[in-house]
């Protein structure tokens, strides 16, 4: 039976040309994660954490993508294509996949802050 | 055109050590993790394991572990594996496998090491 | 360590033969399973990820099937050139490990 549930950053917004942090957090379970996938708006992959063989990185985006803190993502060099949702997969033993999403809104303006709270979708 | 270029066959001593590299070309050479796997005559292959060229991270089979070391040469574009205390078990064919685009699979081989340990 | 089981280890057929060869997995791996195609003397070529995507340049005739421990490579039409030894891995733990490898030969 599948008890957690994932919170993640929810809605946040950033300036083109600065960084965001992707994170996501399973709670309200013991189960083990295995692996981490994050994946982009059109579900292309931007990268994997897995627990034994640590991280991989898509290739196009090695030179943007800086893995943690954690079982998180750095997205760096923002572009204004970056604006849409992402989501978390958590594999987990024994109870199986979580997905979380977060809505990323690059932002031109040079007053745009950085926002970013945990909610459970 | 991807390729990735082996060094030559070895003959080593029990007890000794042996490196073995691989020089990448058409691509960027710190944007792929690379593996190592090896093959013994007639046996199945056997991850020995990857690195990250970029950071110099590594992640090891246990069963390596305390024999073996990938190291690369980013300035070359070319990975290292090398593995110590040889015995005759060890003699197989060592190939570099870069990392897929989706995961820790490989898309490119080398064309394989001969490695022969005996005394 | 995820233990990897294939049948047959070996099989005789013609050209024209459409061939199926199983990949048994020890835990549940989801779909991150590869298939490699290996001849004598050659180093092995990927021909499938992720279960069932097909590796750039690899024909049509080739497809995977399957999930969690289970999974099936199948060669529609079987070429001469198709003649080998296949191999599955999977790519989701430490340490990666492939199968024994299923020889395709002729009949």
């Known amino acids: 039976m599948m008890t957690g549930t994932i919170e993640t950053t929810g809605n946040i917004s950033a300036k083109k040309g600065g960084s965001v942090i992707l994170q996501c957090h399973l709670s309200s379970t013991m189960a083990q994660v295995t692996q981490v996938n994050w994946e982009q708006h059109d579900h292309s992959l931007l990268a994997i954490r897995n627990a034994e063989l640590g991280w991989h990185i898509y290739p196009a985006f090695k030179d943007r993508v800086a893995p943690g803190p954690g079982l998180g993502l750095t997205l760096q060099s923002l572009t204004m294509n970056d604006t849409g949702e992402y989501f978390c997969t958590y594999h987990t033993y024994p109870d199986g996949t979580y997905r979380g999403r977060i809505f990323l809104e690059v932002l031109e303006s040079s007053v745009a802050e950085h926002s970013a709270r945990f909610q459970i979708p | 055109e991807v390729q990735l270029v082996q060094s030559g066959a070895e003959v080593k001593k029990p007890g000794a050590s042996v490196k073995v590299s691989c020089k990448a070309s058409g691509y960027t050479f710190t944007n792929y993790y690379m593996h190592w796997v090896r093959q013994a005559p007639g046996q199945r292959l056997e991850w020995m394991g990857r690195i990250d060229p970029d950071s110099g991270g590594s992640k090891y089979n246990e069963k390596f572990k305390s024999r073996v070391t990938i190291t690369v040469d980013k300035s070359a574009s070319t990975a290292y594996m090398e593995l110590s205390s040889l015995r005759s078990e060890d003699t197989a064919v060592y190939y570099c496998?870069?990392?897929?685009?989706?995961?820790?699979?490989?898309?490119?081989w080398g064309q394989g090491t001969t490695v022969t340990v005996s005394s | 360590d995820i233990q990897m089981t294939q049948s047959p280890s070996s099989l005789s057929a013609s050209v024209g033969d459409r061939v199926t060869i199983t990949c048994r997995v020890s835990?549940?791996?989801?779909?991150?399973l590869a298939w490699y195609q290996q001849k004598p003397g050659k180093s092995p070529k990927l021909l499938i990820y992720?279960?069932?995507t097909l590796a750039e340049g690899v024909p049509s005739r080739f497809s995977g099937s399957g999930s969690g421990t289970d999974f099936t490579l199948t060669i529609s039409s079987l070429q001469p050139e198709d003649f080998a030894t296949y191999y599955c891995?999977?790519?989701?733990?430490?340490?990666?490990?492939f199968g024994p490898g299923t020889k395709v030969d002729i009949k």
């Open positions: 992720n279960a069932k």
């Open positions: 835990e549940n791996i989801y779909s991150y």
């Open positions: 496998a870069r990392e897929g685009h989706y995961g820790f699979y490989s898309d490119y």
């Open positions: 891995q999977h790519h989701y733990g430490n340490p990666l490990t």
